[in-house]
């Protein structure tokens, strides 16, 4: 499991991980599947009209520590979860938008799902 700043990977992690991608598919992706040395993610964001938008894709290993931790953004809501335990694991990620009143929710732990171990900080 991956907590703040720590990057201990599960032993079962594939060297090349395949992830479902939606709105974040690179040019070389086929059938909405991308490949990475890092993590799969699913992200939920709120658009200007308040509509939730769910997207998914691949994250490279470099920089995944700050990508997989919800980082503050002003005046909008966003939440991301990451996984590595198997190919297309992000199909089973279901991040939820933080409550409107609590904008600083994002200072919490990395949202990371391993072997059905789920960290939620909402």
């Amino acid at each position: 499991k991956k907590e703040d700043g720590e990057s201990t990977a599960p032993t079962a992690r594939p060297k090349v991980l395949r992830c479902k991608c939606h709105h974040h598919c690179p040019e070389d992706s086929v059938n909405n599947i991308c490949s990475t040395d890092g993590y799969c993610f699913t992200m939920i964001e709120e658009d200007d009209s308040g509509t939730p938008v769910v997207t998914s894709g691949c994250l490279g290993l470099e920089g995944s520590d700050f990508q997989c931790r919800d980082t503050p953004i002003p005046h909008q809501r966003r939440s991301i979860e990451c996984c590595t335990e198997r190919n297309e694991c992000n199909k089973d990620l279901h991040p939820t938008l933080p409550p409107l009143k609590d904008r600083d929710f994002v200072d919490g732990p990395i949202h990371h799902k391993h072997h059905h171990h789920h960290h939620h900080h909402h």
Epitope: P26, G57, G60, T71, R78
Partner: antibody
Framework: QVQLQQPGAELVKPGASVKLSCKAS????????MHWVKQRPGQGLEWIGM????????NYNESFKSKATLTVDKSSSTAYMQLSSLTSEDSAVYYC?????????????????WGQGTILTVSS | DIQMTQTTSSLSASLGDRVTISCRAS??????LNWYQQKPDGTIKFLIY???RLHSGVPSRFSGSGSGTDYSLTIRNLEQEDIATYFC?????????FGGGTKLEIK
């Protein structure tokens, strides 16, 4: 690793237009906002605007709305900024900078990776 | 637009010193304050985001603090490679704006 390649310099005549390029590599181009920043000689930095390569959505600094037009070519992972009706005031270094965070619709304000900058000289 | 003010435009310090660079916003920016380093050759690096979070690869001698309208960047044990101009930037409100920069020089 993330790389943003910009031409070193451009020389153009007053009244003309120029299209500056920023070729991205080392990441999924369509997933991150790309920002453009201006720096006049010996001066500070000015944010011009941003574009999301996947949607083509843009946000401009009001001061540059009639001056700059941001576009992307997804197939070549290249961002462009066209500057029109050039004057000596437009002579500056122009940087592209990729945002820190993956985003689809939200706007995020972190300029994490910078190109080397293009020196634009407007002179007859 | 939010004005960002770096009152000290240049600063002289000795190697090994602790240096603090200040930045003030014209209104509350809710900790959406970032710091950048520009080397003499023009290269710009992202150092600190959201007031105090170090970007990956940035040495731990850099730190950031502040809240509301007042923010600062501290460099402990100043090294030769830290000689540069430092800019703050607010990310709370469009258009994003930068401070005028603080040029750090060696005594």
């Amino acid at each position: 690793q993330v790389q943003l390649q910009q031409p070193g310099a451009e020389l153009v005549k007053p009244g003309a237009s120029v299209k500056l390029s920023c070729k991205a590599s080392g990441y999924t181009f369509i997933s991150y906002w790309m920002h453009w920043v201006k720096q006049r000689p010996g001066q500070g930095l000015e944010w011009i605007g941003m574009i999301h390569p996947n949607s083509g959505s843009t946000n401009y600094n009001e001061s540059f709305k009639s001056k700059a037009t941001l576009t992307v070519d997804k197939s070549s992972s290249t961002a462009y900024m066209q500057l029109s009706s050039l004057t000596s005031e437009d002579s500056a270094v122009y940087y592209c900078a990729r945002d820190l965070l993956i985003a689809t619709v939200v706007v995020t304000p972190y300029f994490a990776y910078w190109g080397q900058g293009t020196i634009l000289t407007v002179s007859s | 637009d939010i004005q960002m003010t770096q009152t000290t435009s240049s600063l002289s310090a000795s190697l090994g010193d602790r240096v603090t660079i200040s930045c003030r916003a014209s209104q509350d920016i809710s900790n959406f304050l970032n710091w950048y380093q520009q080397k003499p050759d023009g290269t710009i690096k992202f150092l600190i985001y959201y007031t105090s979070r170090l970007h990956s690869g940035v040495p731990s001698r850099f730190s950031g603090s502040g809240s509301g309208t007042d923010y600062s960047l501290t460099i402990r044990n100043l090294e030769q490679e830290d000689i540069a101009t430092y800019f703050c930037q607010q990310g709370n409100t469009l258009p994003y704006t930068f401070g005028g920069g603080t040029k750090l020089e060696i005594k």
